[in-house]
Structures are given as C-alpha cells and as structure tokens.
Interface confidence: low
C-alpha cells in the first residue's frame, strides 16, 4: 500500500534533528572594528559623511570574537529558534583555497567556519559539514581547477583530497559528521555535453570522495572519531502506469541511473551497477548511443569500495516515470525515461509533488540493496510561496516525518537523522527556507520545534524526555575544545 495510517511513536534519543543550509560564504572581516581599534570616531552625518578620529582619546580594546561576524549572529539567532540538534552547512572550496592548492590558504575563511561550528556548539548544536556543494549557476570550484577542465580532469580529485585534508585538520576536532560532496549524481545537469562527459566527471567525483574518505580513515579518524560520507540526490520513482511492465522497469532503471550509479561502487562492489552498464552497452550495440561507462581497474575498484561510514540521502519528492526509447549519446537519453507530471497530486510552486510514502519506499529500497546501515536524510523540504503561514511546508514536514517514523518503527530501518531543507531562503530563488531572505521566521518553525521536542509523534501519555547519556553526545569533548583551542 502507498498511504498507510499515521503512527504514534518516537524517534530514538540520539536522533539528529537538523536543518540544512547550502554554501556559507565566509565574511572576510569581523564587522566590529571598534573592539580592535582603540580610537574614537565621530560621524559627520550632515557634511562629508565621513568618520573623523577624535584625537587624544583612547578606548579599551578586546580580542576579536566569533560573534563579531554579523553573519554568524544571524545564523545563530535562526538556529536557536529552530531548536535543532544539528546544522548542516557547506564550506566554499573556492574561498578556502582560491588557487586550488595548498599554496594559498585563506586562514580568515577557515576562522570564520570554525566560528560557525564553535558558536553552534555553545548552543548545543553540532555541525554536519559539507566540503563541496556544487551549485548549478557555478560549479563552486577554485578558478584554476575550473579552467583546467574541472571534474573532467582526474587531478581535480587529488586537489579535492588536499582540500579535504586541510578541512579535517582545521575543523575536525569540532566536526564529527562530514559530507564530502553534495549530490554528485546531479552534476549530470552541468556535465551534459555528452554521456561520456557525464560519466567521466562522475568517475572523478567518486575518486575524489574515496580519496578524501581514505585520508580521513587513516590520518584523522583515530584521533577525531568522526564519520564521513557523501550526499546523494535520492528522489523515489514510481511507474506512471502501475499496470505497465515497461513502466516498472523504467522506475527501477531511474533508481539505478540516479542512486545506484554512485551507491553501488561506494557501498557495495567498487564498480558501477551491472544493470546500468548493461543498459548503456545494449544501446551502444544498437547504435542508439555512443556512451560508455568507464572501465574500472582493479586498483580503482578497491579504492572506491566501502568508503562510506553512513548513507546520506537528499530526498524531496517522488517522480512518476515511463519508458520511452530515446536516441542520443547523453546521460538523460541513455536512461530511456520520460517523466509524467501528475496534476492530481498536491504540488509546490516549482511542481514538486508531495508524495510522503515515497521516502519510506526509498529507505526500504536502500536497505534491501545496500544492507542495514545508518541512514541520514541530509536534505528534505519543499518550496512554499507563503512568507508567514507556510502551510504546505508544515504539511510536507509532518507527512514526510510520519513516513520516516514508519520506516524506523515498522521497517526497522536504521534512520539516524532528518535534516530539513533549508534554513533561510535566497532572494529570487524558490522559497525553501524556514526564514525569509530578510530573516523573518515562518510558522513552520513552530511546527518543526514541536516535532523535535516530542521526538516525533508520541502517544498522549508517553514521555519525550531523554537521559543525558542517551542524547546525541557525539561531541562531548567539543565544548572543551571550543574554549581551549584558539580561533
């Protein structure tokens, strides 16, 4: 059955209740110079509008503090209102390493990120940090790497490893959950000139992730004891016509091309899914495509296999798919899939269908295919036009969390966290935020607060209290480090 009745019950005490933000652009300077500048100024407000130093007056100064960053104050205010236990945000690779290598490290950017993490910890909010979050407008790569063919160049994977090592070294004492790359399986939207470009870029992204994971595993895990994975875009697929075999096959093929493409090599075999490889090869044989998945060497298979500590999925909706034979040598046509927009379904302004039961099906599919592992939903949300009473978002959150709870209670899926997407919306982008672009809170925040404080949807008389030892204590030593390690 697709929809089943709501359940009453709670998520475990160590469940991560999170909110996700995309790339945080670091502020270059703390915005409170008065604390480091001992001079007093008067503002000539009516004349030349300049600040004029008052001679002979000296003020007490104090060391710079994290909260001198205006941006961080805003972040913290929003996070405090969210009542989450975890905050997922992404670093800006291009800001941290403008040259793409370790020859010019932007220490100020790292200090800013360290401040975000340490100030969050003071509020009891742990960070899940994403190292690389490509956006469709811009790949988010340092310029020199972008100009050297980006992800089509294998050396970008080595550059990523060096960058990851720097971040582990600088932030790893405070950060215990890492995402190397956000949605590498959607970079097909950018590297789409040909299927071979798409598969070549994907291959280098896989290698980049694996190199970073193995570096962490060997050099940093023993002392930092964190966990590393990558986040896959993981929408569910259903046959548009449940009575057509070809539609069922198309739905499974969508999952193979979208999720298994990255999950199979990392979680399971070290190689691409046989179903995907065979499908592309059969199209190749019939002259319908000149695409080919890269052939992995023994060494590459061993490099990739097993390089995840947990499964991280970004899930937003369910797609309704049908088979349609497409010619052309591009990733989109290699799949032979056509999407159907079901206008009878509740949908968002950007046409994202609200299909709560899809997330439960996804979680079961992942467990069936890749085994019983810890799973985090690292982004899940909907766009809602309302600037105050965002009822669609409240409905979405309630229903999707219900299905996640069913997966936990009934299907026994090891679901460890849910991160709602996203903290604040950006101007002129679809409205996914709990806060508007000028930081006004929406009513879905109270709804999410209530679910978090109840740990789900408890029976009337059940306690939502957790003992301190049961709660998420992944960073008990972090607060001590925040005080002791200089920023």
């Amino acid at each position: 059955k697709e929809s089943t009745p709501d359940v009453q019950g709670q998520f475990p005490c160590d469940f991560s209740w999170g909110v996700t933000e995309s790339v945080l652009k670091p502020e270059s300077v703390a915005s409170s110079p008065q604390f480091s500048d001992p001079h007093l100024y008067v503002w000539n407000a009516t004349g030349n509008r300049l600040l004029h130093r008052v001679e002979g007056v000296r003020l007490k100064t104090r060391p710079a503090q994290c909260t001198d960053f205006v941006n961080i104050k805003k972040q913290l205010e929003m996070l405090a209102r969210m009542k989450v236990t975890h905050y997922r945000f992404a670093l800006d690779w291009a800001s941290v390493l403008p040259t793409g290598n370790l020859s010019a490290v932007n220490r100020q950017a790292l200090r800013y990120y360290r401040c975000v993490v340490s100030e969050g910890l003071k509020l009891g909010i742990s960070a899940m940090v994403t190292l690389y979050y490509p956006t469709h407008a811009h790949l988010g790569l340092p310029e020199p790497l972008l100009h050297a063919d980006g992800w089509l160049n294998p050396s970008t994977a080595e550059a990523f490893q060096a960058y990851a090592g720097l971040c582990f070294q600088e932030l790893g004492d405070l950060v215990k959950l890492w995402i190397t790359i956000n949605e590498p399986n959607r970079l097909s939207d950018i590297y789409n000139r040909s299927g071979n470009d798409t598969y070549g870029a994907a291959h280098n992204l896989l290698v980049a992730h694996a190199l970073a994971w193995r570096l962490y595993d060997r050099q940093f895990r023993p002392s930092q004891r964190g966990a590393v994975s990558l986040s896959l875009h993981a929408d569910w697929a259903e046959p548009a016509n449940p009575y057509a075999d070809s539609h069922w096959r198309a739905a499974e093929r969508f999952l193979q091309f979208e999720i298994a493409w990255f999950a199979e090599p990392l979680f399971k075999t070290g190689d691409y899914p046989a179903a995907m490889r065979e499908y592309i090869a059969s199209k190749h044989r019939r002259g319908l495509s000149s695409s080919a998945l890269p052939r992995l060497t023994e060494a590459e298979r061993r490099l990739l296999k097993g390089t995840v500590d947990f499964c991280a999925l970004n899930h937003f909706t369910t797609r309704f798919v049908m088979h349609e034979q497409l010619a052309g040598s591009r990733y989109d046509s290699d799949r032979d899939i056509q999407f159907l927009q079901d206008i009878t379904r509740l949908s968002s302004p950007t046409r994202l269908a609200v299909i709560p039961w899809g997330v439960r099906k996804l979680l079961r599919w992942v467990r069936r295919n890749y085994g019983d592992m810890d799973i985090y939903i690292t982004a899940s949300g909907i766009d809602d036009q309302a600037l105050e009473d965002d009822r669609l978002r409240k409905y979405y959150l309630g229903k999707y969390l219900q299905e996640v709870l069913k997966a936990y209670l009934i299907d026994k899926v090891r679901i460890k966290g849910y991160y709602a997407f996203k903290l604040a919306e950006e101007k002129s982008k679809p409205r996914f935020g709990f806060f508007t672009s000028d930081f006004k809170a929406k009513s879905s925040i109270q709804f999410y607060n209530k679910v978090i404080s109840s740990r789900g949807f408890p029976f009337e008389n059940s306690s939502s209290r957790c003992s301190q030892t049961q709660e998420n204590t992944e960073c008990t030593v972090c607060l001590f480090l925040v005080q002791k390690k200089p920023l």
Epitope: A157, L211, D217, R218, T297, E298, E300, R302, L303
Partner: antibody
Framework: QVQPQESGPELVKPGALVKISCKAS????????INWVKQRPGQGLEWIGW????????KYNEKFKGKATLTADKSSSTAYMQLNSLTSENSAVYFC?????????????WGQGTLVTVSA | DIVLTQSPASLAVSLGQRATISCRAS??????????MHWYQQKPGQPPKLLIY???NLESGVPARFSGSGSGTDFTLNIHPVEEEDAATYYC?????????FGGGTKVEIK
C-alpha cells in the same frame, strides 16, 4: 599500533601443510585488504594474493592458486594463509601486509614475517 | 603479467651523494591520472618499508631525501643526500592490475 602480528616460525615435512596467521589491531579489520607476500632466502618479493575481510573476497596470483588458501576470521581480526603439499620450494619468509588508504594498493603496514622451513 | 626490471642490481654511493634507481615496466602502469608504482626499502631481517606510493608521494614519516618520479613505464627513485642508514635493498612494485609484481631489487651500499 597498526603493524600486524604474524605467527611464529614453522618447521614442516615435505607434503604436509601449514597454516600461518596474521592478527590485525589498531584499525577496522574489515576495511582493508590483507596481502600475503613470499620472500625466499636472499631473493626478491612475490605477491601471493589478498583477502578483503569485509566480504571475505579473495584474489590470487595464478602462480599460487592451489598452493595457498586465504581465509579471515572477523571475530578475532585475524587473517590466515594455508600452504599445502609443501616442497623445499615453499621454504621462505611469508609476510602479511595491509594495503593503504589510497586504493593505490601499496603495502603500508607489514607483519614481521613468518619463516617456513620445509625439511625432512 | 607486468614485469618490472630494476637497474642497477647493486649500487655503491658515497655518503652525501645521490643514489638513483630505475624501474621499467613491461607495460604502462598509469591510468586515470595515477601511476600505480610504489617503492620499498628492506633491511636484512626486517619486512619491507613503504617509502613512496603512487610514483611520487612520500609516505608519512619517510625522510624528504627520498623522492620518486615517472609515469607510464619508466620510474625513478632518488635518494639525496645519501646517509649511512640508507644501506638496504630497494624494490619497486606495481598495482595497476593483477597480479601485483615487484622488481628484482637494487642493493645500495654506502662507500
């Protein structure tokens, strides 16, 4: 300390078999290949094969198929190599070595070696 | 199988001078931007010790006087300046495909 601990020297008769062990510690045993390497006295190094304890998959050098059998026990974090139908050609020091974190298949951590002597 | 040929078989070097060891593969051991060639040092009665991985990367804890270079079929290990403790046999090893193979070794003596 990640260095694997190998079992002690073995003196065995021709035609017999021997099983040598390699105990891992200081890391997650199921995440890395354990390789076995042979070195005859005064000679070079020969790769025998690897076992991946995560799923107990194995790969052998064709030259050692039928001669060496690689196994692993996850509960004790120990890898084993059994050599059968021993002849004087099999007298050698046998090393176990853990592969590195790069997937480059270089061997970072080596056991101290087990000397196997085949003699009547 | 890929055959690795090391030269010279032995080498006597004065303290403080440069030692250069070559390793030639019967076919390319490079792919996808990586060269799957590694170098080890072995002293009598001890297991080999990894010095260089993926052709040119210095293993942690290994002195910077060791360096590796090369791609495709030709690879070189350099030691400069040579020190007393560098007297040992050096092996190259590839991991491009199965079976992994080692070179025959180069014995370095200090004059």
């Amino acid at each position: 300390q990640v260095q694997p601990q190998e079992s002690g020297p073995e003196l065995v008769k021709p035609g017999a078999l021997v099983k040598i062990s390699c105990k891992a510690s200081g890391y997650t045993f199921t995440r890395y290949d354990i390789n076995w390497v042979k070195q005859r006295p005064g000679q070079g190094l020969e790769w025998i094969g690897w076992i991946y304890p995560g799923d107990i998959s194995t790969k052998y050098n064709e030259k050692f198929k039928g001669k060496a059998t690689l196994t692993a026990d996850k509960s004790s974090s120990t890898a084993y190599m059994q050599l059968n139908s021993l002849t004087s050609e099999n007298s050698a020091v046998y090393f176990c070595a853990r592969s590195d974190y790069y997937g480059s298949r270089s061997f970072v951590y080596w056991g101290q070696g087990t000397l196997v002597t085949v003699s009547a | 199988d890929i055959v690795l040929t090391q030269s010279p078989a032995s080498l006597a070097v004065s303290l403080g001078q440069r030692a250069t060891i070559s390793c030639r593969a019967s076919k390319s051991v490079s792919t996808s931007g990586y060269s799957y060639m590694h170098w080890y040092q072995q002293k009598p009665g001890q297991p080999p010790k990894l010095l260089i991985y993926l052709a040119s990367n210095l293993e942690s804890g290994v002195p910077a006087r060791f360096s590796g270079s090369g791609s495709g079929t030709d690879f070189t290990l350099n030691i400069h300046p040579v020190e007393e403790e560098d007297a040992a046999t050096y092996y190259c090893q590839h991991s491009r495909e199965l079976p992994y193979t080692f070179g025959g070794g180069t014995k370095v003596e200090i004059k």
